[in-house]
């Protein structure tokens, strides 16, 4: 029950995280104009990974896409790549984890297969989350660097008479969405990996084997234990280890070191 809950919760958390990563990637507010000097501005600039926008105080908003690929900064391209890789891995992870969910039965899929799929999706979520966090952090670092550079060159005077105020950019809402979403995806991935441990059989699975001669065979148990015949009509697998709430068909019998044939 705990394994199912952990797996289910991991899936839901990852789903929310990946939705957040997609939202952050699409958002226009990766960087927003710093309003420290002028809290009420007549022209407000903000930029995303795919376009830059200007919102006038009149309410008019104009957005322009970055229609060049080669002219864009390498860092921006890297951030785009990291976010897309994060989304792709996350999407594949979600697809895999749906089939791995313990509450969903698909044919005669064994627990070991489900465990492997859960682990795979968990690793994918972890990498997806790390990609998103890395992408957002690279962009944030780029902003911080540019912010202090533009602060140093804030006013460039023309003969000391005319001031040209350089637009400074600070963290936009998308960065926080990205960080949180990446974190959630990471947590979801870890939860899936933990769930995988509970799904996988912890012991080596041996099949119980009985040997018999052509005649009437008797298996002798040392230590004065009662002998039992090998292939009796009423022979059943006995529940010798209860590792938790398991159904009868999930239970394996293990040979004792004292069993001789």
């Amino acid at each position: 029950m705990a394994v199912t809950a952990c797996q289910g919760l991991g899936f839901v958390v990852s789903l929310i995280g990946i939705a957040g990563i997609i939202a952050a990637t699409c958002m226009d507010q990766w960087s927003t104009q710093d309003l420290y000097n002028n809290p009420v501005t007549a022209v407000f600039n903000y930029q995303g990974l795919w376009r830059s926008c200007v919102r006038e105080s009149s309410g008019f908003t104009e957005c322009r896409g970055y229609f060049t690929l080669l002219g864009l900064p390498a860092m921006l391209q890297a951030v785009r790549a990291l976010m897309i890789v994060g989304i792709v891995l996350g999407a594949i992870g979600l697809l895999v984890s749906i089939f791995a969910l313990k509450c969903i039965r698909i044919g005669s899929m064994e627990d070991s297969a489900k465990a492997n799929m859960t682990l795979t999706s968990g690793i994918m979520f972890i990498v997806s989350g790390l990609c998103a966090i890395a992408g957002v952090s690279v962009f944030a670092n780029m902003l911080v660097t540019n912010f202090w550079m533009s602060t140093a060159n804030m006013y460039t005077g023309m003969g000391g008479m005319v001031q040209t105020v350089q637009t400074r950019y600070t963290f936009g809402a998308a960065l926080f969405v990205g960080w949180v979403a990446g974190g959630l995806t990471l947590i979801g991935g870890v939860m899936m990996c933990i769930a995988c441990r509970g799904l996988a059989p912890e012991e080596t699975n041996y099949k119980a084997v009985s040997y018999h001669a052509s005649g009437h065979s008797v298996a002798y148990k040392p230590g004065g234990f009662k002998a039992s015949t090998g292939f009796g009509s009423n022979t059943k697998n006995k529940k010798i280890y209860d590792g938790g709430a398991r159904t009868e068909d999930e239970v394996q019998s293990y040979p004792s070191k004292h069993d001789y044939v």
């Epitope: 600039n45 008019f60 637009t167």
Partner: antibody, heavy 118, light 113 residues
């Protein structure tokens, strides 16, 4: 067609207050901001402030803060400007105008003359 | 506050003449985000409210005759009337539309001989 109809001329005593109205018609009132501009006789234009009729949000010229209070009534599509503690320096023609892209003013009211005299 | 300086304060011209009005701002009105200059030109005739002529420094408002042309970038702007008509007798104001408070120039009075 778009129209901004302002209230009539006012003659008021110093120290009192006056409320100038600006009724909008021919467009969605809440979709555009309304600006108020002051023009003293024979002088240039001075920006007073702006109001968002949809949200009621305002932004004032710091130099005139406390002098003017901007409000808007969505139901009657009317913007108001209340001028308080009037002095002779407040005698002017006051215009309301619609604020559009480019942060420009495309339609203006005819102006309301406010004369402060004892 | 951004200070807008217009020159000349008044100008006497003859009909058909080409006129150039100047406007300078104390700070750049150029916005890098959309590569636009936030300067607006208005025309005010006696006894009337101002009329919008040009916004974004060079975009002509619909219905404005094409003899009116706005140009310039950063801090220096001009309004050019290619062939002055009698109905162009008015005061022309430039306005900073970039930063609050939205300041106006003192105006240039255009008179006909």
């Amino acid at each position: 067609q778009v129209q901004l109809q302002q209230s009539g001329a006012e003659l008021v005593r110093p120290g009192t207050s006056v409320k100038v109205s600006c009724k909008a018609s021919g467009y969605a009132f809440t979709n555009y901001l309304i600006e108020w501009i002051k023009q003293r006789p024979g002088q240039g234009l001075e920006w007073i402030g702006v109001i968002n009729p949809g949200s009621g949000g305002t932004n004032y010229n710091e130099k005139l803060k406390g002098k003017a209070t901007l409000t808007a009534d969505k139901s009657s599509s009317t913007a108001y400007m209340q001028l308080s503690s009037l002095t002779s320096g407040d005698s002017a023609v006051y215009f309301c105008a619609r604020y559009v892209k480019g942060n420009a003013l495309d339609y203006w009211g005819q102006g309301t003359s406010v004369t402060v005299s004892s | 506050d951004i200070v807008m300086t217009q020159s000349p304060s008044s100008l006497t011209v003859t009909a058909g003449e080409k006129v150039t009005l100047s406007c300078k701002s104390s700070q750049s009105l150029f916005n890098s985000g959309n590569q636009k200059n936030y300067l607006t030109w208005y025309q005010q005739k006696p006894g009337q409210p101002p009329k919008l002529l040009i916004y974004w420094a060079s975009t002509r408002e619909s219905g404005v005759p094409d003899r009116f042309t706005g140009s310039g970038s950063g801090t220096d702007f001009t309004l050019t009337i290619s062939s002055v008509q009698a109905e162009d007798l008015a005061i022309y104001y430039c306005q900073n539309s970039y930063s609050f408070p939205l300041t106006f120039g003192a105006g240039t009075k255009l008179e006909l001989t």
